[in-house]
Interface confidence: medium
C-alpha cells in the first residue's frame, strides 16, 4: 500500500466565489474516497466535480475532486481522504 | 464513546474574560469536530461555534463571533473556549459536545460534557 | 436564521401513555447535501441533553425503540410509545442544515 499525498488549492472563480481543488497522487490501490466536507458533512455529489482516478505512470494512481464555495466561508470546507483503512483531512489554504 | 470533562464554575466580574476547557479521552482527538453551546437557566440551547481539532478551522455563530474564540491543545487533548467582555447575560451553562459524522454520518452533539456553570456578577 | 418551534409548551402524560412532539422550522432545512438535518435531544433535570434521534427518523446508539422520528420539509414529530418514568424531562429540537445551527424551544413532558 502507497498512501496519497494530497494537496488542496484555490482559484478564483466568479465574483464573491472561489474554486477549491482538491488533488491525491502517488497512492496505491486504486481505490480512494475523496470528498469535499462542509461543517464536517460531505457535499452532494452534483455540487463537486470529480477527476478519473488515473495512473502517473510509477505503478500508482492520481485524482481529484473540486468544488465552488463562497469566498469568506473557506475554514467552514475541508477535503476528506480515505484510502487503505487510512483517513485524513485537509483545509482549505488561506 | 469517549469522554469529555468540562473545568468547573466560574464566578467572574463583567466586563472580564473566562477560558473554559474540554478536555477529552478515549477517541481520536485530531478527527473530531467539538462544538460549544450556550443554556441560561431555564432556557433552550444556543449553538456557538465548532472547532475541528484535526486543522483548528472553525465555524462561529454570527451572534458570537465577537465574544468567543475556540481553540485546541492537541498534545493534552483539550479544546477551550475563551469568552470575554462578560455582562450579566452571559451569565449560563456552557457544553462541549463531538459530532459523530463518522459514525452516523450525520449527528450533530452526540457526546456532551457535563456542562460548566458562568456566573457573571459585580 | 432558522426559527425551531415546539409544540406544546409542556406535555402532561399518564405512564404508558403515547406522547407526541412537534417541532416546525421557519424555512424547509434540506441541506445542500440532501440530508435533512433535524434531531431531537432529551435533558433531564441537573443533566446535559442526550441525543436520541439524528437525520429526522434515526435512533442514535442505545435509544430504546419506543422512540421514533418522522417528518419532512418544515414539520417533525417525536413520538414516544409508551412513556417510562425515565422518559421525562424536556425535550428539544434542532436543526443542523443552516448555520447557525438552531434548537427550538423545548417541550416538558411531565406526568399528569
Known amino acids: 500500500t502507497v498512501p496519497p499525498m494530497v494537496n488542496v488549492t484555490r482559484s478564483e472563480a466568479s465574483e464573491g466565489n472561489i474554486t477549491v481543488t482538491c488533488r491525491a497522487s502517488s497512492f496505491y490501490p486504486r481505490n480512494i474516497i475523496l470528498t469535499w466536507r462542509q461543517d464536517g458533512v460531505s457535499l452532494s455529489h452534483d455540487t463537486q466535480q470529480w477527476g478519473d482516478v488515473l495512473p502517473d505512470g510509477n505503478g500508482t494512481y492520481q485524482t481529484w475532486v473540486a468544488t465552488r464555495i463562497c469566498a469568506g466561508e473557506e475554514q467552514r470546507f475541508t477535503c476528506y481522504m480515505e484510502h487503505s483503512g487510512n483517513h485524513s483531512t485537509h483545509p482549505v489554504p488561506s | 464513546q469517549g469522554q469529555m470533562q468540562q473545568s468547573g464554575a466560574e464566578l467572574v466580574k463583567p466586563g472580564a474574560s473566562v477560558k473554559l476547557s474540554c478536555k477529552t479521552s478515549?477517541?481520536?482527538?485530531?478527527?473530531?469536530?467539538i462544538s460549544w453551546l450556550k443554556q441560561k437557566p431555564g432556557q433552550s440551547l444556543e449553538w456557538i461555534a465548532w472547532?475541528?481539532?484535526?486543522?483548528?478551522?472553525?465555524s462561529y455563530n454570527q451572534k458570537f463571533t465577537a465574544k468567543a474564540q475556540l481553540t485546541v491543545d492537541t498534545s493534552s487533548s483539550t479544546a477551550y473556549m475563551q469568552f470575554s467582555s462578560l455582562t450579566t447575560e452571559d451569565s449560563a451553562i456552557y457544553y462541549c459536545?463531538?459530532?459523530?459524522?463518522?459514525?452516523?454520518?450525520?449527528?450533530?452533539?452526540?457526546?456532551w460534557g457535563q456542562g460548566t456553570l458562568v456566573t457573571v456578577s459585580a | 436564521d432558522v426559527l425551531m418551534t415546539q409544540t406544546p409548551l409542556s406535555l402532561p402524560v399518564s405512564l404508558g401513555d403515547q406522547a407526541s412532539l412537534s417541532c416546525r422550522s421557519s424555512q424547509n432545512i434540506v441541506h445542500i447535501n440532501g440530508n435533512t438535518y433535524l434531531e431531537w435531544y432529551l435533558q433531564k433535570p441537573g443533566q446535559s441533553p442526550k441525543l436520541l434521534i439524528y437525520k429526522v427518523s434515526n435512533r442514535f446508539s442505545g435509544v430504546p425503540d419506543r422512540f421514533s422520528g418522522s417528518g419532512s420539509g418544515t414539520d417533525f414529530t417525536l413520538k414516544i410509545s409508551r412513556v417510562e418514568a425515565e422518559d421525562l424531562g424536556v425535550y428539544y429540537c434542532f436543526q443542523g442544515s443552516h448555520v447557525p445551527w438552531t434548537f427550538g424551544g423545548g417541550t416538558k413532558v411531565e406526568i399528569k
Open positions: 472547532i475541528y481539532a484535526g486543522t483548528g478551522g472553525t
Open positions: 478515549g477517541f481520536t482527538f485530531s478527527d473530531n469536530y
Open positions: 459536545a463531538r459530532h459523530d459524522y463518522y459514525g452516523t454520518s450525520g449527528a450533530w452533539f452526540a457526546y
